[in-house]
Amino acid sequence: IPAPSIRLVPPYPSSQEDPIHIACMAPGNFPGANFTLYRGGQVVQLLQAPTDQRGVTFNLSGGSSKAPGGPFHCQYGVLGELNQSQLSDLSEPVNVSFPVPTW
């Protein structure tokens, strides 16, 4: 099943202590999906979308960006035929970077 879209939601972090907000959206025909956020292949957080909506926002409190690993990806799962879980492809990666200090 198709990959979700992924994006950072503003305000963007300006330091490693700032929170990070990552939105993941499934295609329109998959409302109420279960979403998983990964960083460097490791599970960071799981969220379920409301039954009438197709997206979730992962809210990572300050310090999450210090964790080792690569960019963030998300994935969603839905119940298919025979109540079997079907997983989507992974989203494109999204990277979190911080502004270079001006001093």
Epitope: P10, P11, A49, G55, G62
Partner: antibody, heavy 123, light 112 residues
Framework: QVQLQESGPGLVKPSETLSLTCTVS??????????WGWIRQPPGKGLEWIGS???????HYNPSLKSRVTISVDTSKNQFSLKLSSVTAADTAVYYC???????????????WGQGTMVTVSS | QSVLTQPPSVSGAPGQRVTISCTGS?????????VHWYQQLPGTAPKLLIY???IRPSGVPDRFSGSKSGTSASLAITGLQAEDEADYYC????????????FGGGTQLTVL
């Protein structure tokens, strides 16, 4: 349900500092799904975002007001506060505090508002 | 002058459909940032009407709907009612300068 209530003086003298507090009831200010913000509305005019704060203390300010604004949070009291320095008559407005929602694949909407408090800058 | 441009006023008769536009640029709506809409009845605080371009909070009638295309967004109200007479504001994020949440200048809706 969550409610927000602004408090503070309704009259401030020019060049002084405007100080307001927003008390959150019916829910925790420490939820990861929300920022907490201040918005103002001069009489007969539109809305202007002042700034927002996360429970951890991370702040974001309107660039046009940044040099004069400080927003702080007190999680133990479930409150956040606004300080606006060097005020002039142009800062006369209704000041609202609001909750900023992050969820459903979106973010940044002011989903719950206080009733607003009128602040007049005059000598 | 607001970063997001709205018509100062619109009007319609009861039962009609009206739309309110919100025109931005490539640094806000055109950059795919979420658009939110608010209704402000006279003498009251604004109320969230639409968030994330199209999503209605619980309790908001389905007569209200939002859409977005390119650098513009629209709020549509069908089956206009007298109690819809209010000011309406759009809001988004603008990435120019240091980044900022921005509001449109507001649109006064009159029900004839």
């Amino acid at each position: 349900q969550v409610q927000l209530q602004e408090s503070g003086p309704g009259l401030v003298k020019p060049s002084e500092t405007l100080s307001l507090t927003c008390t959150v009831s019916g829910g925790s200010i420490s939820s990861s799904s929300y920022y907490w913000g201040w918005i103002r509305q001069p009489p007969g005019k539109g809305l202007e975002w002042i700034g927002s704060i996360y429970y951890s203390g991370s702040t974001h300010y309107n660039p046009s007001l940044k040099s004069r604004v400080t927003i702080s949070v007190d999680t133990s009291k479930n409150q956040f506060s606004l300080k606006l320095s060097s005020v002039t008559a142009a800062d006369t407005a209704v000041y609202y505090c609001a909750r900023v929602y992050y969820g459903s694949g979106t973010g940044g909407a002011f989903d719950i508002w206080g009733q607003g408090t009128m602040v007049t800058v005059s000598s | 002058q607001s970063v997001l441009t709205q018509p100062p006023s619109v009007s319609g008769a009861p039962g009609q459909r009206v739309t309110i536009s919100c025109t931005g640029s490539s640094s806000n709506i055109g950059a795919a940032y979420d658009v939110h809409w608010y209704q402000q009845l006279p003498g009251t605080a604004p109320k969230l009407l639409i968030y994330g371009d199209t999503i209605r909070p619980s309790g908001v009638p389905d007569r209200f709907s939002g859409s977005k295309s390119g650098t513009s967004a629209s709020l549509a109200i069908t089956g206009l009612q007298a109690e819809d007479e209010a000011d309406y504001y759009c809001q988004s994020y603008d990435s120019s300068l240091s980044g900022s949440w921005v509001f449109g200048g507001g649109t006064q809706l009159t029900v004839l």
